[in-house]
Interface confidence: low
């Protein structure tokens, strides 16, 4: 689709005569008829296949035609076409004399023609005007012409339709050849695809307008390149959405179970070695000179009873010193000068001669030890109680007193909070990470179902015959107080008509 434009510039008819040679009276009031048609080697009459246009009277005899001086018919004259411009044309321009105001062909005398020119040739679409001048015996016409495309049509033949737009269907302007030129921030064949924020992750991000980066489910961050871990993930990370990969030392679905109490809490003091022994439990191995669950207590060097055979220990700045009883010597009073004849075995120990009586050995009863059975056995020295349990000597054996939440011979078992049946009145107990929860039966409430919630047993009107109903709050049952003439647990039987029983 395009327009053939014809710009009339000057018409010269100095003698003011018609084509027949007859003069116009009083002068040649001149208008033009233009016929545009397909290329003909010899321009001949026939339909104006590309269009026609007429002007009003533009002047008398000789005159210059100013731009837009033609009133209703603009100058340049417009001959629109709705097809692909073929690149060739034929053009006929006729100058006519109008004796009156009616310019219709049938209203003019047949000899009103002043001049007629016909040209044909090639013409490419373009903005440049082609100037031409045609001269006959008596007249001269100067004019220029060109072909341009209509709005929204482009290309060598005005055949490419392109209408700039900035909406859901595209965001572009049109190039001179009719190709689309996307507006900034848009791409794609029809410029419908926004260009997302630079760096926005190709798979995990998207955008609905330029320079935006919207994250798909499971992703976050300015560029949608950070995954969102599982909701509630405490000490964990993710490499794909909704994961919870635990950091070292943590476990459980949400990585909230401490598997490395030693590292996270450093409970052991005074250089003791810490060993993890399960979730939230640990054991401290104390360095010499320290004791306690966390090796927090400093030992006197004499606390380990280094002196044997009843020797007494004295603390010194650089260690300790044993004062040996008669008959013993050595750093720890370990050497004896006694024999069985001296009854060296204490606490009911039996003496056995060795090396032909030059030496002896004591066989100690239970609970005693030492070369002379002088020491009571301390079964707690190996710190056998786990999870901070306290070790107690009990006669021939030992026992562990466990911290709350632990049980077993060595406090090695984690107690379920529900094990002691804390829920009253038949409530159901649920172990939670930080305690327990009771689900109470009807009629009870409170954290341990310890509060009785009154159930109005009379609400269902169980008593008949206008009996008065009372609720027994201790049993949540009802009692019917019968009016005169009725008996039964619900006052359902008239007196004198006992219920019929099957026996």
């Amino acid at each position: 689709s395009g327009v053939f434009q014809l710009q009339l510039q000057e018409f010269i008819n100095e003698r003011g005569v018609l084509a027949s040679g007859r003069p116009c009276e009083p002068g040649c009031r001149t208008f033009f008829r233009v016929c545009l048609k397909h290329f003909q080697a010899v321009v001949s009459p026939g339909p104006c296949t590309f269009g026609t246009v007429s002007t009003p009277v533009l002047g008398t005899n000789s005159f210059a035609v100013r731009d837009d001086s033609s009133g209703g018919g603009r100058n340049p004259l417009q001959l629109p076409f709705n097809f692909t411009w073929p690149g060739t044309f034929s053009l006929i321009i006729e100058a006519w004399h109008a004796p009156g105001d009616d310019l219709r062909p049938e209203a003019l005398p047949p000899d009103a023609l002043i001049s007629k020119i016909a040209i044909q040739g090639s013409l490419a679409v373009g903005q440049n005007w082609l100037l031409d001048e045609q001269t006959s015996t008596l007249t001269r016409l100067r004019y220029s012409y060109r072909v341009i495309c209509s709005d929204n049509y482009y290309g060598d033949n005005c055949s490419r339709l392109c209408k700039k737009r900035n909406d859901h269907f595209g965001h572009y302007v049109c190039q001179p050849d009719g190709n689309l030129s996307c507006l900034p921030g848009w791409t794609g064949e029809y410029c419908q695809q926004p260009i997302c924020l630079s760096g926005c992750h190709e798979q995990n991000g998207y955008c609905s307008k330029p320079a935006e980066c919207l994250c798909r489910p499971g992703w976050q961050g300015r560029l949608c390149n950070e995954c969102i871990p599982h909701n509630g993930c405490r000490h964990g990370t993710c490499s794909t959405p909704w994961q919870c990969t635990c950091d070292e030392g943590w476990g459980g679905l949400f990585c909230d179970q401490d598997l490395n109490y030693c590292t996270h809490h450093s409970p052991c003091k005074n250089g003791a070695t810490c060993s993890n022994s399960g979730q939230r439990s640990y054991t401290c191995t104390c360095r010499p000179g320290y004791t306690g669950v966390d090796c927090e207590l400093e030992l006197s060097e004499c606390d380990s009873n280094p002196c044997r055979n009843g020797g007494s220990c004295k603390d010194q700045e650089d260690g300790y010193h044993c004062l040996c009883p008669p008959g013993y010597y050595g750093l720890h009073c370990e050497h004896s000068t006694l024999s069985c004849a001296d009854s060296p075995c204490f606490n009911g120990g039996s003496c056995r001669e060795r090396n032909q009586g030059a030496n002896y050995a004591c066989e100690c009863p239970p609970n005693f030890t030492g070369s002379n059975c002088e020491k009571k056995v301390d079964r707690c020295t190996s710190n056998p109680c786990a999870n901070g349990g306290q070790c107690l000597n009990r006669g021939p054996s030992r026992m562990c007193r466990c911290r709350p939440g632990f049980t077993g011979t060595y406090c090695e078992l984690h107690v379920s909070d529900c094990a002691r049946n804390p829920c009253a009145h038949g409530g159901t107990c649920h172990d939670l990470e930080n305690g327990l929860m009771c689900t109470c039966p009807a009629g009870f409430s409170g954290r341990r179902c310890e509060v009785r919630t009154s159930i109005d047993a009379c609400a269902s009107s169980p008593c008949f015959n206008r009996a008065t109903c009372y609720t027994d709050l201790s049993t949540d049952t009802f009692v019917c107080n019968c009016p005169y003439g009725f008996v039964g647990s619900r006052c359902e039987f008239p007196v004198g008509l006992p219920p019929s029983f099957p026996w």
Epitope: N152, L161, K163, D167, H168, F169, E189, Y190
Partner: antibody, heavy 119, light 108 residues
Framework: QVHLVQSGAEVKKPGASVKVSCRAS????????ITWVRQAPGQGLEWMGW????????DYAQKFQARITMTTDTSTTTAYMELRSLTSDDTAVYYC????????????WGQGTLVTVSS | EIVLTQSPGTLSLSPGDRVTLSCRAS???????LAWYQQKPGQAPRLLIY???SRATGIPDRFSGSGSGTDFTLTISSLEPEDFAVYYC?????????FGQGTRVEIK
């Protein structure tokens, strides 16, 4: 003269697929789109989607997205619409129409293809 | 989804009457994207008006369209016998493209 001629009536069983063709003539096929519209018996018009005969780009109504495919064959200037997993609710006359993406009109329309879905 | 509501649902008129059909959109529609179609029983729809007010090729000048934003109107200045039909408005400004439910113009 611009013409759109559609394929003939079809009877299908529930769960089957149907493929309707629409042959265009009288204009430059790739300068326009083809849109598909259906009309259930006694009901109004319902837009299903359109396809650019120039690029093959499609825009389907969400309602049909999962089970519709529109294609064109520029060598035969024919557009096709395939609808899968048919139910009795898909019984309708299916129309194709030429779509101007500059002026946003549907003109002309094909004569319509009746698709009946029945067990 | 842009919902187009046409009113009235049915009009009973005589040849020569002036007709005004209304089409109201649930949200603003650019006038470039609004069209009107005529459909007669057993026939495919026919384009009457596009761009809210431009008459399609070959459509008589008794048909005219107007409106903008959410309110659009199709006017038939003087009903001819062949104008009794169902009239639909349609938008393609927002996906999905939608039609109104139609207005039936019948002979009184």
């Amino acid at each position: 003269q611009v013409h759109l001629v559609q394929s003939g009536a079809e009877v299908k069983k529930p769960g089957a697929s149907v493929k309707v063709s629409c042959r265009a003539s009288g204009y430059t096929f790739t300068n326009y789109g083809i849109t598909w519209v259906r009309q259930a018996p006694g009901q109004g018009l319902e837009w299903m989607g359109w396809i650019s005969a120039y690029s093959g780009n499609t825009d389907y109504a969400q309602k049909f997205q999962a089970r519709i495919t529109m294609t064109t064959d520029t060598s035969t200037t024919t557009a096709y619409m395939e609808l899968r997993s048919l139910t009795s609710d898909d019984t309708a006359v299916y129309y194709c129409a030429r779509y101007s993406w500059n002026f946003h009109w549907f003109d002309p329309w094909g004569q319509g293809t009746l698709v009946t879905v029945s067990s | 989804e842009i919902v187009l509501t046409q009113s009235p649902g049915t009009l009973s008129l005589s040849p020569g009457d002036r007709v005004t059909l209304s089409c109201r959109a649930s949200q603003s529609v650019s006038s470039s994207y609004l069209a009107w179609y005529q459909q007669k029983p057993g026939q495919a729809p026919r384009l009457l008006i596009y761009g809210a007010s431009s008459r399609a090729t070959g459509i008589p000048d008794r048909f005219s369209g107007s409106g903008s934003g959410t309110d659009f109107t199709l006017t038939i200045s003087s009903l001819e016998p062949e104008d009794f039909a169902v009239y639909y408005c349609q938008q393609c400004g927002g996906s999905p493209w939608t039609f109104g439910q139609g207005t039936r113009v019948e002979i009184k």
